[in-house]
């Protein structure tokens, strides 16, 4: 189920790469965030809490990522035209339950000015 397009700037370009921003409400305590390209899982990050509220961060499909209290950023480098596609943030909420999944996304347009190694 696609809940809709991201209602925020999902793609931030810099230095021939792109930061893909996946937001979630900051009261979510435990979750898994997956970055999908089309239907393929590119990256994931899982945040869980153990006894004593110790936080554990795990990735099965590792990308360079950054976690804040209300977003996960995934970074893609060396952009080329093949990166142009629909990208989705697939959020699975474990805590607080009930378990919930939500999918938001947008289309990543690649323009010449954003490519990593343009010919001058």
């Amino acid at each position: 189920e696609i809940n809709g397009s991201a209602n925020y700037e999902m793609f931030i370009f810099h230095n021939g790469g792109v930061q893909i921003l996946c937001k979630y409400p900051d009261i979510v305590q435990q979750f898994k965030m997956q970055l999908l390209k089309g239907g393929q899982i590119l990256c994931d990050l899982t945040k869980t809490k153990g006894s004593g509220n110790t936080v554990s961060i795990k990735s099965l499909k590792f990308c360079h990522s950054q976690l804040s209290n209300n977003s996960v950023s995934f970074f893609l480098y060396n952009l080329d035209h093949s990166h142009a596609n629909y990208y989705f943030c697939n959020l699975s909420i474990f805590d607080p339950p009930p378990f919930k999944v939500t999918l938001t996304g947008g289309y990543l347009h690649i323009y010449e000015s954003q490519l990593c190694c343009q010919l001058k």
Partner: antibody, heavy 117, light 107 residues
Framework: QITLKESGPTLVKPTQTLTLTCTFS??????????VGWIRQPPGKALEWLAL???????RYSPSLKSRLTITKDSSKNQVVLTMTNMDPVDTATYYC?????????WGQGILVTVSS | DIQMTQSPSSLSASVGDRVTITCRAS??????LAWYQQKPEKAPKSLIY???SLQSGVPSRFSGSGSGTDFTLTISSLQPEDFATYYC?????????FGGGTKVEIK
Amino acid sequence: QITLKESGPTLVKPTQTLTLTCTFSGFSLGSNGLGVGWIRQPPGKALEWLALIYWDDDKRYSPSLKSRLTITKDSSKNQVVLTMTNMDPVDTATYYCAHRNSGFDYWGQGILVTVSS
Amino acid sequence: DIQMTQSPSSLSASVGDRVTITCRASQGISSWLAWYQQKPEKAPKSLIYAASSLQSGVPSRFSGSGSGTDFTLTISSLQPEDFATYYCQQYNSYPLTFGGGTKVEIK
């Protein structure tokens, strides 16, 4: 500081549609608010969950009342609206809206709705 | 649906007493249980979430325990302001369900 307040009619006639509005402050659905729910309590009875709407517009309803309930949100106005069709005297209750976290951590003061002809 | 059964439905106690209220779920809900306090003509107030975590600002005389199907709310030393009705609620799955309430009265 999170606050919620219910508004709407306090008296409705049988078969009419009830529309209640929850206006909230201190959180924003999507950034630091997961969702808003509605709960009711008939006089002298227990609490009953009715409906909930998430920041992403995902909606959940009590199965026994699903056919009569609609929940919507207007994030720009910080409001959540519950409509309940075909009201009956047994629907007389105090209706509460509440902020969804682990359970419901903040509640409105409630609005007593009486169904009578 | 998960049924939540509270016992007793009412109890009489004195200031300073230790009070225990139980809540039983019809199927396992892990630790996804909340407790609320409600005074006459007032909205419920959240006391405990995740079975044993105290909400901010709630006095430490309130405590919760349990997991799976059996849960307990304990007031270690009853105070005059604690006379109220207490409800449990499961939020493991939809539909969200509440217990029938336990009224704590003055003996």
